[in-house]
């Protein structure tokens, strides 16, 4: 709290300029006015303030407005929204894309701080859904973005949102998130023809059912095996040895350095060992010859 | 290409005076608050004056104040800094660096030596 | 502002792990530079709001705290890291820097 001081005789400022560079905490208190301050934000971001500085300006703001600020403040808020708590960003209401662009790019460089978060809830929640165009500027910012957000608030991205995700945006997805985007991806992407469908779902394979793997394996799509080591477990172990083949194509040969580590390990373990030798690998620990497989889940669900 | 380059250093008596250029390129040079920072030989950094985008609002340090003189040319995109009744003590290493929207150096240039001696 | 780094100078390997300290004589938030400067040459911004790596600068490099007390850390030191340090406040007016922490080869 700034003690409340006289405003030294000539000191009043007229506008926000670089005069007030040098003004100390108690001058920039007295001298400078609010209303002036709000109407020329603009300007804040052009005078290199110090922290101190800032903090002096943003109590100004918070004594105009003490409902939050309107969305003509926040748009050029620039290096004092660094100052600003999660509490006071859920006091606004932020509408424009271009706001909440003008924000992330102050932020840039940081990671993604409460505040950052506290403002994309807001303007998520404001828009109702997570459309395209703010999918776009949130990963361009934040290339982690859609794997922090819950497999409930996933749920509201519209399919069509899908084609602004790029592989590096779904790095640090679990598989339940991917549960809820591979469905949507498979909707967006539905109209591509075999090959150029691939490249495109492939970041989203994680999500995948057996059905739809087993259907991949058909259409001579090779693909490699760090995207294979990401599949669910459970939609790979009822794949034979000749779907796995044709869907990992050349790249069959890395399941031998693979052997030891899930979803590859548990495969071997369902797979015959006549059928694994077929392939030449030298994969061991398949089903020994003359052994019978009961699946006692199928058997339950019969039951 | 972004730079500062460093310019009109040397040798110089006791009580003598100096000019020193900074020609800024590759980036808005009348947008940037411009500094002179220098080092003396095996010692730190310090800050020795600033100027304002437009030339008009000031800083020196004390141990300066009186005596350098700071100004800018932005048609030319250049810095300068008068030096008068130069001392001993104000031998170094005098870097310009730039600053944009928080006062820190985001560029330096490579710095142009200061000698003052007899 | 006054702004007091060590150790003054340090050695270390290739490899190590290396941790520089600024204490500032008064809170100044997270309002933190850290720069680089090898011999003969300008120093470069590396870190700035305490925290924020600066573009271009490799990821080894990182830095923390927040009122008086700040680190800057290298991972795992590289050949090209043998330099020295200094921070900057920018909390006030006027801006100052730490004394330096020379690092040197062991």
């Known amino acids: 709290e700034v003690e409340k001081t006289a405003c030294p005789s000539g000191k009043k400022a007229r506008e926000i300029d670089e005069s007030l560079i040098f003004y100390k905490k108690w001058e920039l208190e007295a001298c400078v006015d609010a209303a002036l301050l709000a109407t020329q934000m603009d300007r804040v971001n052009a005078i290199p303030f110090t922290y101190e500085q800032l903090d002096v300006l943003k109590h100004k703001l918070d004594e105009l407005y003490p409902q939050g600020y309107p969305e003509s403040v926040i748009q050029h808020l620039g290096y004092l929204f660094l100052k600003m708590s999660p509490e006071d960003i859920r006091k606004w209401n932020v509408t424009s894309l271009e706001t909440l662009k003008a924000l992330l790019e102050v932020n840039k460089g940081h990671e993604m701080s409460p505040q950052v978060a506290t403002l994309i809830d807001r303007f998520v929640k404001g828009r109702g859904q997570l459309d395209k165009d703010t999918l776009d500027t949130l990963t361009a910012f934040y290339p982690g973005y859609l794997c922090s957000l819950s497999p409930e608030e996933l749920s509201s991205v519209p399919p069509s949102s899908i084609w602004a995700v790029r592989p590096q945006d779904l790095d640090t997805c679990d598989p339940r998130q991917l549960d809820v985007l591979y469905p949507k991806a498979r909707l967006a992407f539905q109209n591509m023809n075999g090959s150029e469908y691939f490249v495109k779902i492939q970041s989203f394979l994680g999500g995948a059912p057996t059905e739809d793997l087993k259907a991949l394996s058909q259409q001579n799509v090779s693909m490699d095996l760090a995207t294979f080591m990401k599949l669910r477990t459970d939609a790979v172990l009822p794949l034979t040895v000749a779907e796995v083949q044709k869907l990992l194509g050349p790249h069959v040969e890395g399941l031998k350095a693979e052997e030891r580590h899930r979803p590859v390990r548990d495969w071997i373990l369902r797979q015959r060992q006549d059928d694994l030798d077929t392939l030449g690998l030298g994969l061991q620990g398949g089903i020994p010859n003359g052994y019978l497989v009961l699946d006692l889940s199928m058997q339950e669900a019969l039951s | 290409q972004v730079q500062l380059v460093e310019s009109g250093g040397g040798l110089v008596k006791p009580g003598g005076s100096l000019r020193l250029s900074c020609a800024a390129s590759?980036?808005?040079?009348?947008?940037?608050?411009m500094s002179w920072i220098r080092q003396a030989p095996g010692k730190g950094l310090e800050w020795v004056s600033y100027?304002?985008?437009?030339?008009?609002?000031?800083y020196y340090a004390d141990s300066v104040k009186g005596r350098f003189t700071i100004s800018r040319d932005n048609a030319k995109n250049s810095l300068y800094l008068q030096m008068n009744s130069l001392r001993a003590e104000d031998t170094a290493v005098y870097y310009c660096a730039s600053i944009l929207s928080v006062p820190y150096f985001d560029l330096w240039g490579r710095g142009t030596l200061v000698t003052v001696s007899s | 502002i006054q702004l007091t780094q060590s150790p003054s100078s340090l050695s270390a390997s290739v490899g190590d792990r290396v941790t520089i300290t600024c204490r500032a004589s008064?809170?100044?938030?997270?309002?933190l530079a850290w720069y680089q400067q090898k011999p003969g040459k300008a120093p470069k911004l590396l870190i700035y709001?305490?925290?924020s790596l600066e573009s271009g600068v490799p990821s080894r490099f990182s830095g923390s705290g927040s009122g008086t007390d700040f680190t800057l850390t290298i991972s795992s030191l590289q050949p090209e890291d043998f330099a020295t340090y200094y921070c900057q406040q920018f909390n006030s007016y006027p801006l100052t820097f730490g004394g330096g922490t020379k690092v040197e080869i062991k």
């Open positions: 590759g980036f808005t040079f009348s947008d940037y608050y």
């Open positions: 100027i304002s985008s437009s030339g008009s609002t000031i």
């Open positions: 709001d305490a925290s």
């Open positions: 008064q809170g100044i938030s997270s309002a």
